[in-house]
């Protein structure tokens, strides 16, 4: 999907007021410098198209978040403010519930959030230069 | 104060198209995102889609696909929601709504009328 | 078949406290997702009731109140007048690609005997 004809100031929005508390949630218990941020993205395109493989593709010792609170707000910003995001997604979605593992956060796991969240912290500011 | 004044009931037989018009006044018309929602008679409220009245842009439910046009006027602070391919289950009063939900989250505080099309041979 | 349950009708006399359930899932309500409530008057455009699961719009009586736990949301309306009586509507937003994202209730019709 291309996410360049989102709407990222609602993205965003919804993102501040939902979906990083629910990483916060998640990542409970958990200190900050535990995870040192390996991925990253240039522009909020860019940063999107992670922020969904990161989501919803399953990882080696992380097989899905894709039921967590913070992934279904994700999915529902995306299929919202991202025109044409629902069709595209719908036999990704459909094929990825074959294969879901039972839910179990794993230290792998937390650090595929941790990941996330610099993710979303980069998209919320694209002016700034890369590192 | 915001009104949202909708176009009148249409009549239409199956297979046509219908548009329907939303004239705003009381705010500003390219500050807000434009829902579509409808109520066909004895059943829930149904989201059909948006439409950004500053770029133009629009998304719509999948149900909908190729189906729904959504445009709008600024010089007349004006949207459209035109419907397709009409069919009798189509048959529903249409309502356009602002959507003032400043948390990324769509939330309708004002509405209009309603305008009644009877999709009927 | 609308996502969000609502019973069909409900009703109470003047004066009375009735409540109005509108029940989701994990992939709406019990996703965290917000509740907001509609309410529709015969022959007068909808008006926004309660937003965010217990906020009230400026104009709305504090007899109108909202709360949500789990998968489900509620309505209560204290002190019932005559002019309660209408259509009510909850909406929220589900994760379920395969249907619509922005999602209501089937609708509430209060009676005030």
């Known amino acids: 999907y291309d996410f360049t004809n989102c709407d990222f100031e609602k993205i965003k929005a919804a993102y501040l007021s939902t979906i990083s508390k629910d990483l916060i949630t998640y990542m409970s218990g958990t200190k900050s410098t535990e995870f040192n941020n390996t991925v990253s993205c240039s522009n909020r395109p860019h940063c999107l198209t992670e922020i969904q493989s990161l989501t919803f593709n399953p990882t080696a010792g992380c097989a899905s978040l894709a039921k967590e609170m913070f992934a279904m707000k994700t999915k529902a910003a995306l299929a919202i403010w991202c025109p044409g995001y629902s069709e595209t997604q719908i036999n990704a979605t459909q094929a990825m519930k074959k294969r879901r593992k039972r839910k179990v956060t794993t230290n792998k796991c937390l650090e595929q959030v941790s990941q996330l969240q610099g993710l979303w912290r980069r998209f919320n500011r694209p002016l700034l230069k890369q590192q | 104060q915001v009104q949202l004044v909708q176009s009148g009931a249409e009549v239409k037989k199956p297979g046509a198209s219908v548009k329907v018009s939303c004239k705003a006044s009381?705010?500003?018309?390219?500050?807000?995102?434009m829902h579509w929602v409808r109520q066909a008679p004895g059943q829930g409220l149904e989201w059909m889609g948006w439409?950004?009245?500053?770029?133009?842009?629009?998304n719509h439910a999948r149900k909908f696909q190729g189906r729904v046009t959504m445009t709008r006027d600024t010089s007349i602070s004006t949207a459209y929601m035109e419907l397709s391919r009409l069919r009798s289950d189509d048959t529903a009063v249409y309502y356009c709504?602002?959507?003032?939900?400043?948390?990324?989250?769509?939330?309708?505080?004002?509405w209009g009328q309603g305008t009644l099309v009877t999709v009927s041979s | 078949q609308s996502v969000l349950t609502q019973p069909p009708s409900v009703s109470g006399a003047p004066g009375q406290r009735v409540t109005i359930s509108c029940t989701g899932s994990?992939?709406?309500?019990?996703?965290?997702?917000?509740v907001h409530w509609y309410q529709l008057l015969p022959g007068t455009a909808p008006k926004l009731l309660i937003f965010?699961?217990?906020n009230r719009p400026s104009g709305v009586p504090d007899r109108f109140s909202g709360s949500k736990s789990g998968t489900s949301a509620s309505l209560a309306i204290t002190g019932l007048q005559a002019e309660d009586e209408a259509d009510y509507y909850c909406?929220?937003?589900?994760?379920?690609?395969?249907?619509?994202?922005?999602?209501f209730g089937g609708g509430t019709k209060l009676t005030v005997l």
């Open positions: 709504v602002r959507d003032r939900g400043t948390s990324g989250w769509p939330l309708f505080d004002y």
């Open positions: 009381g705010y500003i018309f390219t500050g807000d995102y």
């Open positions: 439409i950004n009245p500053n770029s133009g842009g629009t």
């Open positions: 994990s992939s709406n309500i019990g996703a965290g997702f917000d």
């Open positions: 965010d699961n217990n």
């Open positions: 909406q929220s937003y589900d994760s379920n690609l395969s249907g619509s994202i922005v999602v």
